[in-house]
């Protein structure tokens, strides 16, 4: 999916008012310095591409983020503010249903959510120069 035509300010508002705290709660008990940010993004569409991938695509050691509350809210926000997103995701969801995993919090998942927090921070500050 090409995130170029999303309403970025509406997504930012959704993140600030409905998603950010759920990411913090997921990470509770973890030091903010525990994980290094290894995933970066250069502009808002790129950030959303990376956020989508880290949130919904199972990875080695962390297969379960898609069923977390912050993921559900992300899915809902993208569907509303990215034209055509919901249509492109319907087929993907049918495939995902066949391999739905039980929610398990692993250290790898914590690291992944830490990366997500960094991506969202970058998304919210698009005018900052890339480090």
């Amino acid at each position: 999916y090409d995130f170029t035509n999303c309403d970025f300010e509406k997504i930012k508002a959704a993140y600030l008012s409905t998603i950010s705290k759920d990411l913090i709660t997921y990470m509770s008990g973890t030091k903010s310095t525990e994980f290094n940010n290894t995933v970066s993004c250069s502009n808002r569409p790129h950030c959303l591409t990376e956020i989508q991938s880290l949130t919904f695509n199972p990875t080695a050691g962390c297969a379960s983020l898609a069923k977390e509350m912050f993921a559900m809210k992300t899915k809902a926000a993208l569907a509303i503010w990215c034209p055509g997103y919901s249509e492109t995701q319907i087929n993907a969801t049918q495939a995902m249903k066949k391999r739905r995993k039980r929610k398990v919090t692993t250290n790898k998942c914590l690291e992944q959510v830490s990366q997500l927090q960094g991506l969202w921070r970058r998304f919210n500050r698009p005018l900052l120069k890339q480090q």
Epitope: K21, K73, K75, I80, S86
Partner: antibody, heavy 117, light 107 residues
Framework: QVQLVESGGGLVQPGGSLRLSCAAS????????MSWVRQAPGKGLEWVSG???????YYADSVKGRFTISRDNSKNTLYLQMNSLRAEDTAVYYC???????????WGQGTLVTVSS | DIELTQPPSVSVAPGQTARISCGGD??????VYWYQQKPGQAPVLVIY???KRPSGIPERFSGSNSGNTATLTISGTQAEDEADYYC??????????FGGGTKLTVL
Amino acid sequence: QVQLVESGGGLVQPGGSLRLSCAASGFTFSSYYMSWVRQAPGKGLEWVSGIFFDGETYYADSVKGRFTISRDNSKNTLYLQMNSLRAEDTAVYYCARQQYFDHIDIWGQGTLVTVSS
Amino acid sequence: DIELTQPPSVSVAPGQTARISCGGDSLGGKYVYWYQQKPGQAPVLVIYGDSKRPSGIPERFSGSNSGNTATLTISGTQAEDEADYYCQSYTNALSTVFGGGTKLTVL
């Protein structure tokens, strides 16, 4: 303007079935997470069920296995199929647009379901 | 999973400040929303994201959430604010949960 209009409520005997419908207008229905919320006479609000744009569903424990939520995005319509109805299911049923799988920003006017012999 | 506890009733004199509490285990780690419902009408969202007001909701409505308690505050309460108020949050099992409701009486 943004509107949700429920229909299909009425009197039904215990063990019976009923299907509620909710016609949506004024917004891109196919993009939104939609829910049903009920309110028994003189009581508080109780979330019943919700459904994503892609058909992914969620249910309250009290209705799991008896109620089925569905949607037809081509008709901008939300449904609630209620089977094995009990007296405690008697309530006003509200169709609701649940913004971001989160808060409810738009409510219908409600339709009354009465389960009684 | 989380249960939300509200006082059944709160009374306030016109012009005074009304505070309605909503309690739940570690509620401060979740977002809380508040609805106003008048007799015979559907509920109306008055606070979302703990403390944000939807457009059209008067400034006298405010919200806070920390620890185990969320609070809806109505400053300079008016007669038209008399209604039932419900808090709402969510569970780890991805379901929506409401408090039992509080009847606000403006004396």
